[in-house]
């Protein structure tokens, strides 16, 4: 089979063979090479020369195969917007940001632009675990049977009820979704004022 055309090459139907790495240049009606990530177009192509690419300067980047004549400026993660850096900007990738702990992304435009504090989950509930931390606000779900959570918190997890017998104690009061089991020494009666607490 014949070798494929190498840019620049004529394109009467205005489409290029490799859409990722080539682009149609309408003035010359040809397909030219895009510049690889981390570079930009320093000289445009013509019918007798392909695109000339140059490396992005420090503190700038281009993430994709492109025909941009400039590189994008690296931007820091804005702490005022609740963002923190997880990976620095390189010539091939913008600064990677995420919401600070205890926050979720409240505004999304291709990437997170603004984070807000996660809502508290009331006692007896916990935040449903998400695939990606910081992606959305808390969705509080009841503690499953045998577990409790006794604070208003965005991050507290339901804990298993204490098993009194594991500590050589006996149950004085059963646990609820909002409170732990109350245990007592098997030899001692539970004083009224100690109701709802665990005796050791």
């Amino acid at each position: 089979s014949q070798p494929q055309a190498v840019p620049p090459y004529a394109s009467e139907n205005q489409t290029c063979r490799d859409q990722e790495k080539e682009y149609y240049e309408p003035q010359h009606r040809i397909c030219c090479s895009r510049c690889p990530p981390g570079t930009y177009v320093s000289a445009k192509c013509s019918r007798i020369r392909d695109t000339v690419c140059a490396t992005c300067a420090e503190n700038s980047y281009n993430e994709h195969w492109n025909y941009l004549t400039i590189c994008q400026l690296c931007r820091p993660c804005d702490p005022v917007m609740g963002l923190e850096e997880i990976a620095p900007c390189t010539s091939k990738r913008k600064t990677q940001c995420r919401c600070q702990p205890g926050m979720f992304c409240a505004a999304w435009a291709l990437e997170c632009t603004h984070c807000e504090l996660l809502s508290d989950c009331p006692p007896g509930t916990e935040a449903e675990l998400k695939d990606e931390v910081g992606k959305g606000n808390n969705h509080c779900v009841p503690c499953k049977a045998g577990h409790f959570q006794n604070t208003s918190s965005p991050s507290a997890r339901c804990q298993p009820h204490t098993r009194c017998e594991n500590q050589g104690l006996v149950e004085a009061a059963p646990g609820t979704a909002q409170s732990d089991t109350t245990c007592k020494n098997p030899l001692e009666p539970l004083p009224p004022e100690m109701s709802g607490t665990m005796l050791m």
């Epitope: 014949q2 070798p3 055309a5 190498v6 620049p8 090459y9 004529a10 009467e12 003035q27 010359h28 009606r29 040809i30 013509s46 019918r47 007798i48 020369r49």
Partner: antibody, heavy 123, light 110 residues
């Protein structure tokens, strides 16, 4: 109006040198790749050399490589061809066309040829 | 020996149609646009067809161009005595990094 005027031709002995000029007007010379094309008496068109718009790259036909040098002065809108070690087979009319439909795709009256300048190499 | 191959001559009677072929390879005609030039006797070449098949303003529609693979064809209908000239195809050769021309075709109107 686009115009190209070649000059500098004449009769020269084999082994001698000659410098051709091409004065451009009516278009933005510095935006265009330029060329020299020659036509020997009774023969067809023969491409000689090409220079990029900014002078950064040059191409030569095998028949003139090492003997001819193309250059340009964009501030003066002028193209040059320095011809050294001339031979009888270099006898021709020399043109400096824009050939813009071939090299850039511009065609709005831009593929223009001058009247040419005659070079005769004879002892 | 030209990189692009044209017949040395063609002829036809006035009012007739004639075609001039120009064949090359993938690195020139195959990948690039072809221009046709007309050189009337004693004059300089003039652009006749560009981008394989387009006519500059002022060129009558009796002149046409087409491309198929690594060959192009110039067609002239309604031949006139004033069409007697040399016709050249030209393009860029990506492998040679050179402008390449056909050897030229002399058109005679009988």
């Amino acid at each position: 109006q686009v115009q190209l005027v070649e000059s500098g031709g004449g009769v020269v002995q084999p082994g001698r040198s000659l410098r051709l000029s091409c004065a451009a007007s009516g278009f933005t010379f510095s935006n265009y790749d330029m060329h020299w094309v020659r036509q020997a008496p009774g023969k067809g068109l023969e491409w000689v050399t090409t220079i990029w718009y900014d002078g950064s790259n040059k191409y030569y036909a095998d028949s003139v490589k090492g003997r001819f040098t193309i250059s340009r002065d964009n501030s003066k809108n002028t193209l040059f061809l320095q011809m050294n070690s001339l031979r009888a087979e270099d006898t021709a009319v020399y043109y400096c066309p824009t050939l813009s439909t071939v090299t850039t795709g511009d065609y709005y009256g831009m593929d223009v040829w001058g009247q040419g300048t005659a070079v005769t190499v004879s002892s | 020996q030209s990189v692009l191959t044209q017949p040395p001559s063609v002829s036809a009677a006035p009012g007739q149609k004639v075609t001039i072929s120009c064949s090359g390879s993938r690195s020139n005609i195959g990948n690039n646009y072809v221009s046709w030039y007309q050189q009337l006797p004693g004059t300089v070449p003039k652009l006749l067809i560009y981008d394989n098949s387009k006519r500059p303003s002022g060129i009558p529609d009796r002149f046409s161009g087409s491309k198929s693979g690594t060959s192009v064809t110039l067609g002239i209908t309604g031949l006139q005595t004033g069409d007697e000239a040399d016709y050249y195809c030209g393009t860029w050769d990506s492998s040679l990094s050179a402008v390449v021309f056909g050897g030229g075709t002399k058109l005679t109107v009988l």
